[in-house]
């Protein structure tokens, strides 16, 4: 994990109000009772900061110890700081919990850059602004780490929401969400609305502002506009999906669709950027450069290193293209597309130039481990992780940042043939050789 890249995002003040709307008629297939409607107690339960992650408040132990926990759909361990660390304001103190049980087993998680290690146990866990339940869950008590916690990020642990297959030390360690569903009547589904501010926030603004919502067990109508479109979860490990086509300003990249999913495509709230396989990244950047050719930017900008600044309020959004990803639909030979704006893929950066400037980093980057639809994508959409039906839904987020000319979009259906051929089949290897890092 390279936190500057792998951990998400700016939170913040979205454009549209987040107040609840009345449920309305849609053309979607009917859902079973209890899965839809109003989840007022969970709306606005996320906070965060640019590039540093969205977090939810959780309590652990008896009596309850309150911690802020990073919401990460790209991993499967519930792990919390459990020893003093210079970047932690607080940490889980197992000795103070009467309900803590030691599993007498260690866990070690190395990343591309950095690592954490700790001791496994179980304890009682609840989410104050979530379902009114308490569950006994596995907890990795982090005793040692390197380049994992982020100074000033305000979170003390990580909630891995993906599947057991990628849990550490192995798939026998039940992830938190599996425990929640097994032990309660919470439906096997959660949804995320991550709200990018569109401008950098300082620490006090982050604490006072909305970062978004994690709706556990359902879908809240107030958080999206238009219809939800679903793509199948290809395999239950990461939240793996299949991209069948990519367009820049409506121009097809015209690559073999296998390239878009080489070696996988995942939806990951724990990654800041939209990360693309090398060949796809190079083609996409070439196309974005061509579309924005009235202005030129240094190579370091396209590499996500240098910042580009404009006088406050003069960012030329119009010269940058929209990016559309077509995802496999639920119906044979049918796809739909999600479209993001430069307001999503140019990430506001704070504290670098004067207050008279708006500065940005290019938040699309190269990957050697497949496509990662990180916060750059998720900030445009309300994303439903429908585990029960093995599918992920996308709708336009009510809080996405846009301008008067363009908006993020979810549109379909489109006819796309041979979509199954777009998936890449990873050669089976010994699990111990799998790469943990998502840098």
């Amino acid at each position: 994990t390279q936190h500057g890249i792998r951990l998400p995002l700016r939170s913040g003040l979205g454009g549209a109000p987040l107040g609840l709307r009345l449920p309305r008629e849609t053309d979607e297939e009917p859902e079973e009772p209890g899965r839809r409607g109003s989840f007022v107690e969970m709306v606005d339960n996320l906070r965060g900061k640019s590039g540093q992650g969205y977090y939810v408040e959780m309590t652990v132990g008896s009596p309850p110890q309150t911690l802020n926990i990073l919401v990460d759909t790209g991993s499967s361990n519930f792990a919390v700081g459990a020893a003093p660390h210079p970047f932690l304001h607080r940490y889980y103190q197992r000795q103070l919990s009467s309900t803590y049980r030691d599993l007498r087993k260690g866990v070690y998680v190395p990343y591309t850059q950095g690592k954490w290690e700790g001791e496994l146990g179980t304890d009682l866990v609840s989410i104050p602004h979530g379902p009114n339940v308490t569950v006994r869950a596995n907890i990795a008590a982090i005793t040692e780490s390197d380049k994992f916690f982020i100074n000033g990020s305000n979170w003390e642990g990580i909630l891995g929401l993906a599947y057991a297959e990628i849990a550490r030390p192995d798939d026998s360690l039940e992830p938190f969400f599996d425990s929640l569903v097994k032990q309660t009547h919470v439906p096997n589904l959660f949804s995320l609305q991550l709200c990018g501010a569109g401008f950098p926030l300082n620490q006090s603004e982050v604490l006072a502002s909305v970062g978004g919502s994690m709706i556990i067990g359902g879908i809240d109508h107030s958080l999206y506009t238009g219809s939800l479109w679903y793509t199948p979860i290809r395999r239950e490990w990461y939240y793996e999906v299949i991209i069948v086509r990519v367009e820049i300003n409506g121009q097809d990249l015209k690559m073999d669709c296998k390239e878009y999913n080489y070696d996988k495509s995942i939806v990951d709230s724990g990654t800041t950027n939209l990360r693309l396989p090398k060949k796809v990244f190079e083609a996409a950047v070439k196309s974005i450069k061509a579309a924005s050719s009235t202005e030129k930017f240094p190579d370091g900008f396209w590499l996500g290193e240098q910042l580009v600044c404009w006088q406050a309020g003069t960012t030329p959004w119009n010269i940058f293209p929209v990016i559309s990803l077509y995802l496999m639909g639920e119906v044979t030979n049918q796809s739909f597309r999600i479209t993001i704006l430069p307001q999503q893929y140019l990430r506001p950066v704070e504290d670098v130039a004067t207050s008279q400037d708006d500065c940005y980093k290019f938040a699309i980057s190269q990957s050697s481990t497949g496509t990662v639809m990180g916060a750059v994508i998720m900030e445009g959409f309300y994303v439903v992780f429908d585990r029960a039906r093995k599918r992920i839904g996308f709708a336009v987020s009510a809080c996405h940042v846009h301008d008067e000319f363009r908006t993020a979009a979810v549109e379909g259906p489109f006819v796309t043939l041979d979509m199954e051929d777009c998936g890449y089949n990873i050669p089976q290897t010994d699990e111990s050789t799998l790469m943990t890092g998502r840098a």
């Epitope: 050719s293 009235t294 202005e295 030129k296 930017f297 240094p298 190579d299 370091g300 900008f301 290193e305 240098q306 910042l307 580009v308 600044c309 504290d351 670098v352 130039a353 500065c359």
Partner: antibody, heavy 120, light 108 residues
Framework: QLQLQESGPGLVKPSETLSLTCTVS??????????WSWIRQPPGKGLEWIGN???????YYNPSLKSRVTISVDTSKNQFSLKLSSVTAADTAVYYC????????????WGRGTLVTVSS | EIVLTQSPATLSLSPGERATLSCRAS??????LAWFQQKPGQAPRLLIY???NRATGIPARFSGSGSGTDFTLTISSLEPEDFAVYYC??????????FGGGTKVEIK
């Protein structure tokens, strides 16, 4: 080889507009590999970036000068120009035009500079 | 705003001596830093770009190092023509705008 040459009045009255032109010779101002820049240096002091222009006309200005600065390009004459309005004695400086090269990052070629004095 | 602080303000050395000039950024600029030389009555000349790459035609006695916030320009053995003012400039924030205050290298 490419050369840059500044030209314009050496004396400007307070409250008036300073106008300078930079002529590019030995190459085309329309090369896509470069921005063209103005930088100034008050007597005995350090360097201050004023702004850049691309041959397409796209401009970037120093926020502290933005309200008074206009940079324009004339590709037919292979020239780019600086206008700085409402000048005061604090605008007295040697004004340099420069090429922003090395991937649009570094001022790799400079004119010799021209001293502009603001005085009545 | 990123501020570049150069030290010392003045460096008094003799020809043949080694000169070490420092440039410190108020926050990381990665390796996006340049060094310029300016002689009296002349325009600045690019010496080093990307912290350590010599520009075309610059003698090997000039070298740059550093990344992040701390950078150094070294002149291994001063020649008479090297006595001048040296400026650093960051381009981490683009367009390039911030220069250091300069270090004057004078004959002792």
């Amino acid at each position: 080889q490419l050369q840059l040459q500044e030209s314009g009045p050496g004396l400007v009255k307070p409250s008036e507009t300073l106008s300078l032109t930079c002529t590019v010779s030995g190459g085309s101002i329309s090369w896509s590999s470069y921005y063209w820049s103005w930088i100034r240096q008050p007597p005995g002091k350090g360097l201050e970036w004023i702004g850049n222009i691309y041959y397409s006309g796209s401009t970037y200005y120093n926020p502290s000068l933005k309200s008074r600065v206009t940079i324009s390009v004339d590709t037919s004459k292979n020239q780019f120009s600086l206008k700085l309005s409402s000048v005061t004695a604090a605008d007295t400086a040697v004004y340099y035009c420069a090429r922003l090269g090395h991937g649009y990052n570094y001022f790799d070629l400079w004119g010799r500079g021209t001293l502009v004095t603001v005085s009545s | 705003e990123i501020v570049l602080t150069q030290s010392p303000a003045t460096l008094s050395l003799s020809p043949g001596e080694r000169a070490t000039l420092s440039c410190r950024a108020s926050q990381s600029v990665s390796s996006y830093l340049a060094w310029f030389q300016q002689k009296p009555g002349q325009a600045p000349r690019l010496l080093i770009y990307d912290a350590s790459n010599r520009a075309t035609g610059i003698p090997a006695r000039f070298s740059g190092s550093g990344s992040g916030t701390d950078f150094t320009l070294t002149i291994s053995s001063l020649e008479p023509e090297d006595f001048a003012v040296y400026y650093c400039q960051q381009v981490y924030v683009w367009p390039p705008r911030t220069f250091g205050g300069g270090t004057k290298v004078e004959i002792k």
